[in-house]
């Protein structure tokens, strides 16, 4: 296993609709044709997998149908979007990139993006 640099933004604020987007960029050391991207969430020293996708270079990123993540790839850059976030989902979201094929296998883990989610205030009942 060889190490690889990964960069991502330090902080992102989710939209009022609970959507957060960020870029994950990796320093590809060679001609990888198969790449796996995983988003991990770290909160209270617990790390859980949020979503993962494997893609072939030049093809779209495909997450499972029930995934809360969507994404697009462009070269060694992945644009990730996480949906359905609530305030309780605030945490550090870490981008993990693996170059699966051809060998050698490379692994890169970013420093994480702190995503802040603020639940919208419910609208007060209005009397007309």
């Amino acid at each position: 296993c060889k190490a690889m640099h990964v960069a991502q933004p330090a902080v992102v604020l989710a939209s009022s609709r609970g959507i957060a987007s960020f870029v994950c960029e990796y320093a590809s050391p060679g001609k990888a044709t198969e790449v796996r991207v995983t988003v991990l969430r770290q909160a209270d020293s617990q790390v859980t997998e949020v979503c993962a996708a494997t893609y072939m270079m030049g093809n779209e990123l495909t997450f499972l149908d029930d995934s809360i993540c969507t994404g697009t790839s462009s070269g060694n850059q992945v644009n990730l979007t996480i949906q359905g976030l609530r305030a309780m989902d605030t945490g550090l979201y870490i981008c993990k990139v693996e170059l699966m094929y051809p060998p050698p296998y490379y692994l890169g883990i970013g420093n994480g993006t702190q995503i802040y989610v603020i639940d919208p205030e419910p609208c007060p009942d209005s009397d007309f």
Epitope: H5, A7, Q8, V23, E25, Y26, A27, S28, P29, G30, K31, A32, T33, M57, G58, G75, N76, Q77
Partner: nanobody
Amino acid sequence: QVQLVESGGGLVQPGGSLRLSCASSGDTLESFAVGWFRQAPGKEREELACIGRTGEFTDYPGSVKGRFTITRDNAKNTVYLEMVNLKAEDTGVYYCAAERLVFHLCSLSEYDYDTWGQGTQVTVSS
């Protein structure tokens, strides 16, 4: 749109040195990571070096590490490849390529670059 033009190639003796330049005649290069590649006759294109947008991150394959150095001058819109102790096997057409990135990293994979120059010929021979 960024357009790349390589220069600085030529005939050099074994053990000699060259400095190649990659200049942009379109957009400013500072939003782009830049890579250098070469293609020798009858061989696949080979990665040589890359440099991130700010110049703080560079990467090289083991085959040229210590002999080739990539630098950039964003004020001059130019990326350089300094090559020393050249060998006959360094002969080929040298290309620079650019990729617009958000952060400071770069890639050694030709698959990641979408803009390429026309190339400059380097011949190492006595």
